[in-house]
Amino acid sequence: GELETSDVVTVVLGQDAKLPCFYRGDPDEQVGQVAWARVDPNEGIRELALLHSKYGLHVNPAYEDRVEQPPPPRDPLDGSVLLRNAVQADEGEYECRVSTFPAGSFQARMRLRVLVPPLPSLNPGPPLEEGQGLTLAASCTAEGSPAPSVTWDTEVKGTQSSRSFTHPRSAAVTSEFHLVPSRSMNGQPLTCVVSHPGLLQDRRITHTLQVAFLAEASVRGLEDQNLWQVGREGATLKCLSEGQPPPKYNWTRLDGPLPSGVRVKGDTLGFPPLTTEHSGVYVCHVSNELSSRDSQVTVEVLDPEDPGKQVDLVSAS
């Protein structure tokens, strides 16, 4: 006769491990008992359980309520056992020793591998600002057994580097993603992808990049000279910029206070019916937590009675 078993049994943490041991013998042979033992390099061989053909299943008190026979129907030649709720400490070598009548004793060893799936965590790096050099965007850490694979999935150009720390029963892997921040990266996803044999599918954690920047400011509204004539209504100046965080806008007049009736609404300066009093140099001040920018324009309101005058537009940043 011979034993049918497996060299390696692999289970995920918390699952039940079936340790297989089937005696393939002649029709007149019987299995008297099957003794299961844990083979430890330090502690030696320690009995786990014993299946007795006459007196049933015996379980080592250290494994009480954790060792069972597979559910019926059972073949009397099948000495397999179930180890319930596998934990990391169960990982190791096991021995099945079958005592048969009249053929004698047979034994086989197998390795139980307990996979510990990782629970990854993603930590964003320091705040990203346009103009910085190579900067940490995020780091991703996953610990498991065996060591997980940690990679990055993104359209953003950058570099990744990994390091691992080995513990007695697991390994922690940390991967860092570095990039040179630019405004085009704003809102782009950066995804940490963790692969592991104990996972049915990769675990993914996505971080949305935020890069602080402030664009140059410019003023629009003076393009149509006909709008800037005495008596015209609806004249506006609009300050153009963009940034992250979104910028705040402030309007001032360089050569005095804003004329009465001029209304500031965010990035737009709205004028009442125009008079020559509205001529002057207007300054748009744009700022966010990162920086500030200025743009100024000179407004000259034309009097139709004085056709020699023209609107003069000067823009400076």
């Epitope: 003794a35 007196y55 009548f101 009249p102």
Partner: nanobody
Amino acid sequence: EVQLVESGGGLVQAGGSLRLSCAASGSISSINLMGWHRQAPGKQRELVATITRGGSTNYADSVKGRFTISRDNGKNTVYLQMNSLKPEDTAAYYCVDVEPSGMGWRDYWGQGTQVTVSS
């Protein structure tokens, strides 16, 4: 042949404890199983507990949590610690040694020791 000698029986009040011992001698196998059965007057003999040479155990549901079986392989002795005894535990307790024999197992029995639990 195997000879078994039990000791430790007696009269005890409900809730009390007793420890039974059974020493085996003779042709003891390296894969033997030892244990205890009991038989109350007018009833069939029933399994109480058995223990392997490696220390794995099997208990009847009626004694789980109250009785503990142990063995000393060097002395070929098996013990039964009985706590929280109840009147229904009253019976003759028999030691058994289960040895491989030919095409199966042979049970060797002791003479028994009486346990009486009074209420």
